[in-house]
């Protein structure tokens, strides 16, 4: 069967019907359907006016305008808001009421596209394998990235989050039109990786998506990741404005000037330094989502009531931090180079600026505890990777899972750890699953380009597609049309259960309490350390006129939820203020070159997981780790849960102005609507209340935006805002 021309709100579209094998199955593929009008720089996306006749949707459109990997030119286009659809078809009737999976690509909110890298004439984000193996509709799309997607003045002049609004427009378009392609508009699953995983998370938390999303999967990135929220957007806006010759004294004049500046100039005005970094890469990515008081009405930690009815899978790769650690400390991948205690201490201190000397020493001691018994270079290098994995990915993901679970009503929560080792032959043997290594398996590359892979890779890919698509169908990764290797139990605050995804899976793949000691350290011990003053915490910013962008100031509130710590029955305590931090790491779409498989298979190279031609650019923002409840001005640590205590502890309130509210389970009060004033972030009910989602506070044309304190511009960012 085949669809032929499909009528959408824009008009008729015609794709291509691709036959699969001899049994009569096929897939209808539509590439390049506009879901919004051509963009205007630094403005919200607008509906597409439509077309007459039948649109031939047979080729991918250009990606959104972005810098090349060398950052000396641009590619892509301003006219970029297009989506792609894969619809599996059987022999007889056209498909009806299929589950829909919408992919959001990663790339540090800086790069990427809906189709991804092209390798062996096969695009990374080609939805065909998922669609045909899982019998689901797959949708991918482009959204604006970099300054054009995320530049913000922190107020109504340039509220920011244009890229997030593009994503929302695509989701809403799918909701309105997918029935015509055979999809079920009431069964939409978002999935994404890295910045895409964080975007998935943010979309579930935004009140704009109420009723649009049924399920969600975040791979290696959540809204609470320290690189996701920019707390000082004005700092970065001014940097770009200075570069392109716009006035910086008055935000309104600066905004007007930026809007009429050549978009290519805006894009190239921002460069992420890739070598010789004085601080961890995380410090340098400036253009990421902001709390705008409207699309993201409050700190994400306070918005989990909005996701109470959305089934959720979140997980990380066991060495997600490897690519970033190897950029921050190149010795990691070099057998002839050593990692010293001094090297690691320096790295740790750069991630723990706000806690000063005590933060650096305590963190260093916790992570180097094993070095006495095993001083080998392999162990030391693994420690560095574990440290960045924990801070950038694992701990924030654990907190997000705990928050989702604590707020969920009927919704289910599942956690995973992807551990199938990287195929990069240039990496040391001890390297596990690096950042973005999971993408190729989710998208079925071992089947699409089989010569680049081994049977065990196909086993992993088959399992992931089965779990992911079963989940999209039913909300339970075990139930659906696809057989799975073992039962995946839901995550609960009591068991902290997670599925370890490897080439051999059985009942022992279901594990509990991942890295509990380190999770406890970040959310309890580290949190309790006093925050040092600006002066004590401020390393000297980069000087000279190098391309290295100076590090922006940090926000002034340290907050975040306490996840369950393994043996406590107490639900996590949501924090109350800025969870906050910087941007996102590349994500699979950023572009490592193709790599030949290792071993003696003689097989051709493994498709790259990126799409630009160099190792992915890690995140860089101003925070480097998962958020944690504020410690207050008193320095008194929050009382940790004791295991069998009744209500969870309430940490001190810090300087955010609003005390955190622990989940109560039976609150009927509606969430507080944010006012746009960052001093009082709204705290939604976190239990199983029937409370409505937190609504936006204004119209999207002039969203209230929390003010940014521009007075601390010389200050370095706090990397870990726990």
């Amino acid at each position: 069967a085949k669809l032929g021309a499909v009528y959408t709100e824009g008009g008729f579209v015609e794709g291509v019907n691709k036959k699969l094998g001899l049994l009569g199955d096929s897939v209808d593929i539509f590439k390049g359907i506009p879901f919004a009008a051509p963009t205007k720089a630094l403005e919200n996306p607008q509906p597409h006016p439509g077309w007459q006749g039948t649109l031939k949707a047979k080729n991918f459109k250009k990606r959104c305008l972005q810098a090349t990997i060398t950052q000396d030119s641009t590619y892509g286009d301003e006219d970029c808001l297009y989506l792609n659809i894969w619809v599996p078809q059987g022999r007889k009737q056209v498909s009806r009421d299929l589950p829909v999976m919408i992919w959001i690509y990663g790339g540090a909110f800086l790069m990427g596209s809906g189709h991804g890298a092209n390798f062996l004439n096969n695009y990374l984000y080609d939805g065909e394998e998922i669609a045909t193996r899982g019998n689901v509709i797959v949708v991918t799309f482009n959204y604006r990235v970099g300054p054009l997607g995320f530049l913000s003045t922190g107020d109504a002049n340039l509220p920011g989050n244009y890229g997030l609004r593009d994503q929302h427009m695509a989701i809403a378009w799918v909701k309105r039109n997918i029935a015509a392609f055979g999809g079920d508009p009431n069964n939409i699953t978002l999935f994404g990786e890295s910045a895409g995983g964080a975007s998935v998370s943010l979309q579930t938390l935004s009140p704009y998506n109420k009723g649009l999303i049924r399920r969600a999967i975040s791979q290696s990135g959540v809204a609470l990741s320290p690189w996701v929220i920019q707390k000082n957007p004005l700092f970065w806006a001014k940097k770009v404005a200075e570069k392109v010759g716009c006035p910086v004294g008055d935000a309104a004049r600066m905004a007007q000037c930026l809007k009429v500046t050549d978009p290519r100039a805006l894009t190239l005005a921002y460069k992420v330094p890739l070598a010789g970094l004085e601080y961890p890469m995380l410090h340098y990515v400036g253009f990421v989502p902001v709390i705008d008081g409207d699309f993201i009405p409050a700190d994400p930690i306070n918005l989990y009531a909005n996701a109470a009815d959305i089934d959720y899978i979140a997980g990380t790769n066991n060495m997600d931090g490897h690519i970033f650690a190897s950029i921050d400390m190149p010795a990691i991948n070099k057998g002839n180079k050593k990692v010293t205690e001094e090297d690691f201490y320096k790295l740790v201190s750069e991630f723990t600026i706000t806690k000063g000397l005590r933060g650096a020493k305590t963190t260093f001691d916790v992570y180097t505890e094993s070095w006495a018994q095993d001083p080998s270079q392999e162990n030391k290098k693994k420690t560095v990777v574990d440290f960045e994995t924990d801070v950038l990915f694992l701990v924030p993901t654990e907190i997000a899972l705990a928050q989702h679970r604590a707020n969920a009503k009927s919704a289910k929560t599942y956690a995973y750890l992807f551990s199938h080792p990287s195929r990069m032959p240039v990496y040391p043997k001890w390297v596990g699953a690096d950042h973005a290594d999971d993408i190729q398996y989710v998208f079925g590359k071992p089947f699409a380009t089989p010569t680049g892979y081994r049977p065990q890779d196909r086993t992993v890919s088959k399992a992931m597609i089965a779990y992911w698509t079963n989940f999209a169908k039913t909300g339970d990764p075990n139930m659906g049309d696809s057989a799975v290797p073992t039962h995946w139990e839901p995550y609960t605050t009591e068991n902290s259960g997670y599925l370890e995804i490897t080439k051999k899976m059985g009942s022992s793949s279901m594990k509990r309490s991942l890295r509990t000691n380190f999770l406890r350290y970040w959310t309890l011990t580290y949190l309790a350390l006093p925050t040092v003053t600006d002066q004590e915490a401020t390393p000297v910013p980069p000087t000279g006129d190098s391309e290295a962008t100076p590090v922006p100031p940090t926000g002034d509130s340290e907050t975040a939820p306490v996840p369950p710590t393994g043996d406590s029955g107490a639900p996590p305590v949501p924090p109350t203020g800025d969870s906050g931090a910087p941007p996102v790491p590349p994500t699979g779409d950023s572009g490592a070159p193709p790599v030949p498989p290792t071993g003696d298979s003689g097989a051709p190279p493994v498709p790259p997981t990126g799409d630009s031609g160099a190792p992915p650019v890690p995140p860089t923002g101003d925070s480097g780790a998962p958020p944690v409840p504020p410690t207050g001005d008193s320095g008194a640590p929050p009382v940790p849960p004791t295991g069998d205590a009744g209500p969870p502890p309430v940490p001190p309130t810090g300087d955010s102005g609003a005390p955190p509210v622990p989940p109560t389970g039976d609150s009927g009060a509606p969430p507080v609507t944010p006012t746009g004033d960052s001093e009082t972030a709204p705290v939604p009910p976190t239990g199983d209340s029937g409370a409505p989602p937190v609504p936006p506070t204004g119209d999207s044309e002039a969203a209230p935006v929390p003010p940014t304190d521009d007075s601390k511009e010389a200050q370095m960012p706090a990397v870990i805002r726990f």
């Epitope: 032929g4 021309a5 499909v6 009528y7 959408t8 709100e9 824009g10 008009g11 008729f12 015609e14 509906p47 597409h48 006016p49 439509g50 077309w51 007459q52 006749g53 039948t54 809403a172 909701k175 309105r176 039109n177 029935a179 015509a180 009723g211 649009l212």
Partner: antibody
Framework: QVQLVQSGAEVKKPGASVKVSCKAS????????MHWVRQAPGQGLEWIGV????????SYAQKFQGRVTMTRDTSTSTVYMELSSLRSEDTAVYYC????????????WGQGTLVTVSS | DIQMTQSPSSLSASVGDRVTITCRAS?????MNWYQQKPGKAPKLLIY???RLQSGVPSRFSGSGSGTDFTLTISSLQPEDFATYYC????????FGQGTKLEIK
């Protein structure tokens, strides 16, 4: 100027079929989609479906799927809407309506054709 | 399908009055169109793309809204404005509101 002229009123028995025509003039016939909308006596407007006169592509509302067929004749700049297995509830005024621009609203309407289904 | 709820279903007003008709869509939509229909006549396009006035339509008619809530406003009713008004959305399966009959008080 744009004109859409529809065929005259019809009286049909239940189970029969009816074919209503809509002749277009004053613009390039193949350049704009043509929709069919009906209105039962004293009721609101109901979308039936759409045809692209350029290539003949059609899309029908779920409710009418299997019962409605839209065709066009480019030589006479005419579109047709045939509704089969008629029942009394199909008694209505049937309108053809042309897109105004892009995919947007229905900017030009025919005068309507009353179809009465009665035994 | 997208559900459209138009209110009120009928309305009595006098010449010179300001009148507002609302239409709520679920889920949210891109654009709303508004039509006027007089007895025995075909509908006539008034407002398209939410707020754009069709040529030849008097400026006392205006449209606004976004997402789920849309409004048609007649700033000062004239005798010829007494008619039935319909909202209309374009998705892959277009739908109309139930109509608002505007009568002379």
């Amino acid at each position: 100027q744009v004109q859409l002229v529809q065929s005259g009123a019809e009286v049909k028995k239940p189970g029969a079929s009816v074919k209503v025509s809509c002749k277009a003039s004053g613009y390039t016939f193949t350049s704009y989609n043509m929709h069919w909308v009906r209105q039962a006596p004293g009721q609101g407007l109901e979308w039936i479906g759409v045809i692209n006169p350029g290539d003949g592509a059609t899309s029908y509302a779920q409710k009418f799927q299997g019962r409605v067929t839209m065709t066009r004749d480019t030589s006479t700049s005419t579109v047709y809407m045939e509704l089969s297995s008629l029942r009394s509830e199909d008694t209505a005024v049937y309108y053809c309506a042309r897109d105004y621009y892009g995919s947007s609203p229905l900017g030009y309407w025919g005068q309507g054709t009353l179809v009465t289904v009665s035994s | 399908d997208i559900q459209m709820t138009q209110s009120p279903s009928s309305l009595s007003a006098s010449v010179g009055d300001r009148v507002t008709i609302t239409c709520r869509a679920s889920p949210s939509i891109s654009y709303m169109n508004w039509y006027q229909q007089k007895p025995g006549k075909a509908p006539k396009l008034l407002i398209y793309a939410t707020s754009r006035l069709q040529s030849g339509v008097p400026s006392r008619f205006s449209g606004s809204g976004s997402g789920t809530d849309f409004t048609l406003t007649i700033s000062s009713l004239q005798p010829e404005d007494f008619a039935t008004y319909y909202c209309h959305q374009r998705s892959s399966s277009p739908t109309f509101g139930q109509g608002t009959k505007l009568e002379i008080k």
